[in-house]
Interface confidence: medium
């Protein structure tokens, strides 16, 4: 693996703008009629994947202007169990709706200081940030 | 939203190492007994989420040493349909196993040039990169 140095801007270097980019699925623009998926346990026959899933979920915005990406979305399961494929509404207790997590690489900006300690712009500090991506219908874990 | 300047290292600035971090779920260390989940359609009663899912998937490594993160993992569905919650093995054609995609923010390193055009280290160029996160059991889309 290669090692990369961190970086700080200094006068005279290019300063193209780094605009905000979300890195987990931005909930698609959707008709307000789909709002009810956020309160009831059902799997739709249309709409985005998170509405058609038998482990449906909604997205919750997490915004931090000192972080790149500034907007992250966390999945929140709408049902404890999976929705029946047959009806699209009744729960099937044989399946659990579980969150899938991942550790997202994010960058926080913090002041950079030059040799004399004077402020020289911003440095990016890399961190892992736990994000829930989706809800997945799983068979319950059987303990051996 | 705030706008952030891009950054390039220059002499005299901190150069802490930016080490490789994977940003989608690194397949957990698992007994190789779970290898077989990758060849037949079944939902396990133990193991990681991607094995217990009724839309099981495996992870495929995508490595690029000139990208941050250097390692990304793409989900690959193991089944066209969802596995029956009852048996954990038979397919239920009423459900489709569909990939959930997102546009991952990644950074590519490229040479930075100073005022006089001389090489001054690396700049990070931000891009969107499409990654599949998981497979989700969904009700087939009904066309109106």
């Amino acid at each position: 693996y290669s090692h990369w140095p961190s970086c700080c801007p200094s006068k005279g270097y290019p300063s193209e703008e780094l605009l905000r980019w979300s890195t987990v699925p931005v909930p698609p623009l959707k008709p307000a009629s789909l709002d009810f998926h956020s309160v009831s346990c059902r799997a739709s026959e249309d709409g985005p994947l998170n509405s058609r899933a038998i482990s449906p979920w909604r997205y919750e915005l997490d915004r931090d202007l000192n972080r790149l990406p500034q907007d992250l979305y966390h999945a929140r399961c709408l049902c404890p169990h999976c929705v029946s494929l047959q009806t699209g509404s009744h729960m099937d207790p044989r399946g659990n709706s579980e969150l899938l997590y991942h550790n997202q690489t994010v960058f926080y900006r913090r002041p950079c200081h030059g040799k004399k300690g004077n402020h020289k712009g911003y440095c990016l500090e890399r961190r892992l940030y736990r994000v829930s991506l989706a809800c997945v219908c799983v068979r319950p874990r059987v303990m051996g | 939203y705030s706008h952030w300047p891009s950054c390039c290292p220059s002499k005299g600035y901190p150069s802490e190492e930016l080490l490789r971090w994977s940003t989608v779920p690194v397949p957990p260390l698992k007994p190789a007994s779970l290898d077989f989940h990758s060849v037949s359609c079944r939902a396990s009663e133990d193991g990681p989420l991607n094995s217990r899912a009724i839309s099981p998937w495996r992870y495929e490594l995508d490595r690029d040493l000139n990208r941050l993160p250097q390692d990304l993992y793409h989900a690959r569905c193991l089944c066209p349909h969802c596995v029956s919650l009852q048996t954990g093995s038979h397919m239920d054609p009423r459900g489709n196993s569909e990939l959930l995609y997102h546009n991952q923010t990644v950074f590519y390193r490229r040479p930075c040039h100073g005022k006089k055009g001389n090489h001054k280290g690396y700049c990070l160029e931000r891009r969107l990169y499409r990654v599949s996160l998981a497979c989700v059991c969904v009700r087939p889309r009904v066309m109106g």
């Epitope: - | 190789a32 007994s33 290898d35 990758s38 060849v39 037949s40 359609c41 079944r42 066209p80």
Partner: antibody
């Protein structure tokens, strides 16, 4: 009844390649994996690897991984195993087997076998 | 690789006898063990999977037991058609490995 029907016997010279086919019927091909196993004359069974018919995922035994390729064709529900740079010790009966979908891995149906003879 | 050792390597028994074949793994494989029967010139046939589950269509006189490293295949009442080689297989870790086989002959 599930059936796996393999191609006929082959005689090859050292350094050549062989491609054995395995035609599956009477089950949903994409839901199962196919494994390949060989048996040298008078010897035991040796696992060569497997492939997911839907996922295309392959896992090969280290002993042959540089010389073997497994593929599937969903349109004809056929699995293939190609072994390159044949040596005399590759002489064996090659079997394809379906990987079952229970909570563990097992080979629930087998092809009849294909004898591959490597001789100069 | 996990080594699978079967014993005995061969046995001869009479019709109606109770026959026991053992298989030992070189490391713990939990219950990831299958048993196959192979007759001369034929492909193996699955008898038992996951150490003790009887494959559909296999006679009830066949049974399997064990976990960890030691496993047993039992034929409660040997029948004339039960001759052949019995082979164990571990599926805990790749490469999957097979035992050397136990040849069962009818007296």
């Amino acid at each position: 009844q599930v059936q796996l029907v393999q191609s006929g016997a082959e005689v090859k010279k050292p350094g050549a390649s062989v491609k054995v086919s395995c035609k599956a019927s009477e089950y949903t091909f994409s839901n199962y994996g196919i494994s390949w196993v060989r048996q040298a004359p008078g010897q035991g069974l040796e696992w060569l690897g497997w492939i997911g018919a839907y996922s295309g995922f392959t896992k090969y035994a280290q002993k042959v991984q540089d010389r073997i390729t497994m593929t599937t064709d969903a349109s004809t529900t056929t699995a293939y195993m190609e072994l390159r740079n044949l040596r005399s010790d590759d002489t064996a009966v090659y079997y394809c087997a379906r990987v079952g979908t229970g909570t563990d891995s097992y080979f629930d149906f087998w092809g009849q076998g294909t004898l591959v003879t490597v001789s100069s | 690789d996990i080594q699978m050792t079967q014993s005995p390597s061969s046995l001869s028994a009479s019709v109606g006898d109770r026959v026991t074949i053992t298989c030992r793994a070189s490391q713990n494989i939990n219950s990831h063990l299958n048993w196959y029967q192979q007759k001369p010139g034929k492909a193996p046939k699955l008898l038992i999977y996951t150490a003790s589950s009887l494959q559909s269509g296999v006679p009830l006189r066949f049974s399997g037991s064990g976990s960890g490293t030691d496993f047993t295949l039992t034929i409660s009442s040997l029948q004339p058609e039960d001759f052949g080689i019995y082979i164990c297989q571990q599926t805990y870790i790749t490469p999957l490995t097979f035992g050397g086989g136990t040849k069962v002959e009818i007296k």
